[in-house]
């Protein structure tokens, strides 16, 4: 059982554990999200992503979650259960990112560019909100991310 993001294979990640970690904090995160009209992982970000694109897109999205979302939220929360859940998610995201090596070949430019444009839509939506609201919304949308990642899961 592994993820196949196009040519990028990821082993050793148990989706069940990601879901368990998310569900442990889901109600808290989504209850704190007061901006229900906006969505960061909107349709245009995740719709019809090709296999070739998927490696680039999941790499940039998970790196953003690691460097911006988890890192900043970690400094703002004190509840042990919440920290534990985010640590589980973050550790697994690290494991995924560490195995992703998107091709930097020139012939992949258009695919890389398409994935980057998708990521920019997400980042732009994130930056339009104030920091606290953006972090909360990004964490509350981890289920959208996990659901989309299922497309690339292999039994």
């Amino acid at each position: 059982q592994e993820f196949h993001f196009g040519p990028c294979q990821v082993k050793g990640v148990v989706p069940q554990k990601l879901w368990e970690a998310f569900w442990a904090v889901k109600d808290t995160m989504q209850a704190q999200d007061n901006i229900t009209s906006a969505r960061l992982l909107q349709q245009e970000v995740l719709q019809n992503v090709s296999d070739a694109e998927s490696c680039y897109l999941v790499h940039t999205l998970l790196e953003f979650y690691l460097k911006t979302v988890f890192k900043n939220y970690h400094n703002r929360t004190v509840e042990v259960r919440t920290l534990k859940s985010f640590s589980t998610l973050a550790n697994n995201f690290v494991l995924i990112v560490s195995q992703l090596q998107p091709s930097q070949e020139n012939e992949m430019f258009s695919i890389r560019d398409s994935a980057h444009r998708r990521f920019l839509l997400f980042r732009r939506a994130f930056k339009q909100l104030d920091v606290e609201a953006a972090l909360t919304k990004a964490l509350g949308e981890v289920d959208i991310l996990l659901t989309w990642m299922q497309k690339f899961y292999k039994l």
Epitope: P15, Q16, E20, W23, A24, W148, Q150, K151
Partner: antibody, heavy 119, light 106 residues
Framework: ELQLVESGGALVQPGGSLRLSCAAS????????MSWVRQAPGKGLEWVSH????????FYAESVKGRFTISRDNAKNTLYLQMNSLKSEDTAVYYC????????????WGQGTQVTISS | SYELTQSPSVSVALRQTAKITCGGD??????AQWYQQKPGQAPVLVIY???RRPSGIPGRFSGSNSGNTATLTISGAQAEDEADYYC?????????FGGGTHLTVL
């Protein structure tokens, strides 16, 4: 060999209670979320309830919320569905299913157990 | 709540191609599964993650998922493919099944 065996189905009067069991073998039970899915006579599949591998997260269909309780005993490799305040519309074959992703990827199903609610 | 729409029945001539569709709002951003069920039997997973085939499922079964429609295609339908087919996705802490499509092989 992976196996899911449901039991506990019976004929019960409206308003009554029933507890279904699903004995699992051939895989590490607590590593996987599980679900109950039912099928009324001549009808389609209807998801009933879901429980995470550690048992801490549970979800229910609106039609059974407040009446049914899903649980698991990981030491006994067994999934349960406690059904209270049963109605005639709960009549169905109840299947337990192993979730291979944690959010609705049912690669393995039991053979089902018949629940009939009638006076 | 999220809904999936399937046509109740589809007919196909033996060894021809059958297409069964499943409609849902922005279903293309979700992972779609397809199950085959024969009378008196439990469902069997035939396609998962939009287009992947579990081991043991014949190569004539394929799937796609884009926009508002997921599609199960059976290329060169066989008599044993006559069954009910259900699409399914996960949406906000719940599994959702389509109403089912009965495939008749003529």
């Amino acid at each position: 060999e992976l196996q899911l065996v449901e039991s506990g189905g019976a004929l019960v009067q409206p308003g009554g209670s029933l507890r279904l069991s699903c004995a699992a073998s051939g895989f590490t039970f607590d590593d996987y979320a599980m679900s109950w899915v039912r099928q009324a006579p001549g009808k389609g599949l209807e998801w009933v309830s879901h429980i995470s591998g550690n048992g801490r997260s549970t979800f229910y269909a609106e039609s059974v919320k407040g009446r049914f309780t899903i649980s698991r005993d990981n030491a006994k490799n067994t999934l349960y569905l406690q059904m209270n305040s049963l109605k005639s519309e709960d009549t169905a074959v109840y299947y337990c299913a192993k979730d291979d992703y944690g959010s609705g990827l049912y690669a393995y199903w039991g053979q089902g157990t018949q629940v009939t609610i009638s006076s | 709540s999220y809904e999936l729409t399937q046509s109740p029945s589809v007919s196909v001539a033996l060894r021809q191609t059958a297409k069964i569709t499943c409609g849902g709002d922005n279903i293309g951003s979700k992972s779609a599964q397809w199950y085959q069920q024969k009378p008196g039997q439990a469902p069997v997973l035939v396609i998962y993650a939009d287009s992947r085939r579990p081991s043991g499922i014949p190569g004539r079964f394929s799937g796609s998922n884009s926009g508002n429609t997921a599609t199960l295609t059976i290329s060169g339908a066989q008599a044993e493919d006559e069954a009910d087919y259900y699409c399914q996705v996960w949406d906000v802490s719940a599994a959702v099944f389509g109403g089912g499509t009965h495939l008749t092989v003529l």
